[in-house]
Interface confidence: low
């Protein structure tokens, strides 16, 4: 019998795009692709394994912003950006099973407007196949 | 006989914590995990397995200090950042087998307190599964 | 029969090292290592697989120049500096089968030597092993 | 407090060498790039010299290249400059500087001056 | 090889604005930095990368480039401003070169 080597089972990632921030609210994001191995359920992107991740965060705004991207209700931001028109961040977290991944957005303009987004990106990438999973 | 996929051998990887560093010499290092794939002695973070690594480097200190991240006697740092009271920076570097991930830390100051650190925090993430690993 | 646990596939990733750049053209890459699992062709890496990549670029040049990398003609680049005179960044990029990563490079000085470059090293990781890949 | 304290300026006869050092202090001195500097007695300032923050890069002035050396002494946290073959044109005031970033000049020493005279 | 162009003196007057230009060819495309010299001491840096204060210089200390030239603003001069100042930038073969300088009179 022919040994075939093993192939990686798919790792979990995602890109999502946003084009579009609401003030006191978040970003509305979409997937572009049907392929990814996670999932955005409510505006927010779904972890179901455990361990660290890769993300990268990108975006040109209309307006200037304060941003910050949570996991889980009580915990301090995965990112924190304050008073910017503009986001390139790269970092590393370790998330779990149940986390959920989403923005929250401040603006200090008077105007109740939607924030335009240009080039808005959110990726993440697990770090850790082979540790604890929950689909 | 049902084949069942192949999951994936665990990843090594650490994430190590750090509340207090010491002039001239470097930072006191704790796992706060046990089920961590790498492990910590003697104040370093040992390499097993040869190849790249995801670095990322977090902290708030006390004082204003110039901070180093070594990995091999004679080579030039991992990091290296001079005058500084935070570090959130994030790199790659090749790592081998024998290496040891260490910290060395100088402060200016005339006291020889020593520094504290608030959300001190060092994550390497092998990026090469498959390479050559020595346990 | 014993089970052994099965091994990683290599994942497909490179080190580039450059110590050149010619005006309003690249930078002269060599991989130092014959075990890298990705090739340099025509002064471009060749990208096999498709998915995410962490890309890390560092170098310090010997003028102020303006520098881009590329990976489809068409497309914006994966990173773009303007008059710098060193370069330490990471990204993370979505690459696929048939892309070539290269340098474009403009100095903006009245002599038309290369530029020389110290420290000149670009690292391609490949983040989604057990997507598609074509050899 | 950053420091920069050059030694080993003083009177030569042309044709002759001198060595001068500047003992840094008050940084990290592998991570900052070095660069040597002169002014002439009632010139302006004129680059000589550089080197790397790891040291396998350097660059000097045309008039001085093959006749100066710049290294420096990690262990000694000493940037050197080796002059040979002096002129009576090299007669200055040398300045060591370091930068975080290799085009700056971020921090000066006081000088130490080399005067060429038969 | 590049040449870096400044007036040998500049005058102004107490608290008004003083400009002092350094000419280079296309100098808008280098970053330009210059430097305070007093006299018997060692060379400051006051602006980087066109136009960046370095911690502790005053915020009347302004820098600007585009073109062939570029300009150090000193908006209401001071009598310790009085000093020699020198723009720089790294040329096209890995040296750093210096203007001239220009000595401001502050009146």
């Known amino acids: 019998l022919q040994q075939v080597p093993p192939q990686y089972p798919p790792i979990q990632s995602i890109r999502v795009q946003f084009t579009r921030c609401e003030n006191e609210k978040g970003c509305i994001i979409t997937s572009p692709s049907k392929d990814e191995t996670m999932k955005v359920q409510d505006n927010s992107i779904i972890i179901n394994c455990d361990g660290f991740y890769l993300i990268s965060l990108k975006g040109y705004f209309s307006e200037e912003l304060s941003l910050s991207l949570y996991y889980r209700k009580g915990r301090g931001p995965l990112f924190s950006l304050s008073k910017v028109t503009s986001v390139d961040s790269i970092g590393v977290a370790y998330l779990a099973f149940k986390d959920k991944v989403y923005f929250n957005v401040t603006t200090h303009s008077t105007s109740y407007k939607d924030i335009q987004v240009n080039g808005g990106e959110l990726i993440l990438i697990h770090q850790n196949p082979g540790g604890f999973c929950a689909y | 006989l049902q084949q069942v996929p192949p999951q994936y051998p665990p990843i090594q990887s650490i994430r190590v914590q750090f509340t207090r560093c010491e002039n001239e010499k470097g930072c006191i290092i704790t796992s706060p995990s046990k089920d961590e794939t790498m492990k910590v002695q003697d104040n370093s973070i040992i390499i097993n397995c040869d190849g790249f690594y995801l670095i990322s480097l977090k902290g708030y200190f006390s004082e204003e200090l110039s901070l180093s991240l070594y990995y091999r006697k004679g080579r030039g740092p991992l990091f290296s950042l001079s005058k500084v009271t935070s570090v959130d920076s994030i790199g790659v570097a090749y790592l081998a087998f024998k290496d040891k991930v260490y910290f060395n830390v100088t402060t200016h100051s005339t006291s020889y307190k020593d520094i504290q650190v608030n959300g001190g925090e060092l994550i390497l993430i092998h990026q090469n599964p498959g390479g050559f690993c020595a346990y | 029969l014993q089970q052994v646990p099965p091994q990683y596939p290599p994942i497909q990733s490179i080190r580039v090292q450059f110590t050149r750049c010619e005006n309003e053209k690249g930078c002269i890459i060599t991989s130092p290592s014959k075990d890298e699992t990705m090739k340099v062709q025509d002064n471009s890496i060749i990208i096999n697989c498709d998915g995410f990549y962490l890309i890390s670029l560092k170098g310090y040049f010997s003028e102020e120049l303006s520098l881009s990398l590329y990976y489809r003609k068409g497309r914006g680049p994966l990173f773009s500096l303007s008059k710098v005179t060193s370069v330490d960044s990471i990204g993370v990029a979505y690459l696929a089968f048939k892309d070539k990563v290269y340098f474009n490079v403009t100095t903006h000085s009245t002599s038309y030597k290369d530029i020389q470059v110290n420290g000149g090293e670009l690292i391609l990781i490949h983040q989604n092993p057990g997507g598609f890949c074509a050899y | 407090e950053v420091q920069l304290v050059e030694s080993g300026g003083d009177l030569v006869k042309p044709g002759g060498s001198l060595r001068l050092s500047c003992v840094a202090s008050?940084?990290?001195?592998?991570?900052?790039?070095m660069n040597w500097v002169r002014q002439a007695p009632g010139k302006g300032l004129h680059w000589v010299a550089f080197?790397?923050?790891?040291?396998?890069?350097?660059s000097y002035e045309d008039t001085v290249q093959g006749r100066f050396t710049i290294s420096r002494d990690y262990a000694k946290n000493t940037l050197y400059l080796q002059m040979n073959s002096l002129r009576a044109e090299d007669t200055a005031v040398y300045y060591c500087?370091?930068?975080?970033?290799?085009?700056?000049?971020?921090?000066w020493g006081q000088g130490t001056l080399v005067t060429v005279s038969s | 090889s590049y040449v870096l162009t400044q007036l040998p003196s500049v005058s102004v007057t107490l608290r008004q604005t003083a400009h002092i230009t350094c000419g280079g060819d296309i100098i808008g495309s280098k970053s330009v930095y210059w430097y305070q010299q007093k006299l018997g001491q060692a060379p400051v840096m006051i602006i980087y990368r066109d136009n960046n204060r370095p911690t502790g210089i005053p915020e009347r200390f302004s820098g600007a480039s585009s073109g062939n030239t570029a300009t150090l603003t000193i908006s209401g001069s001071l009598a310790e401003d009085e000093a020699d100042y020198y723009c720089?930038?790294?040329?096209?073969?890995?040296?750093?070169?210096f203007g001239g300088g220009t000595h401001l009179t502050v009146l």
């Open positions: 008050g940084f990290t001195f592998n991570t900052y790039h």
């Open positions: 720089q930038v790294w040329d096209s073969r890995t040296q750093a070169l």
């Open positions: 080197i790397n923050s790891g040291g396998s890069g350097t």
């Open positions: 500087a370091c930068g975080s970033i290799w085009t700056h000049f971020d921090y």
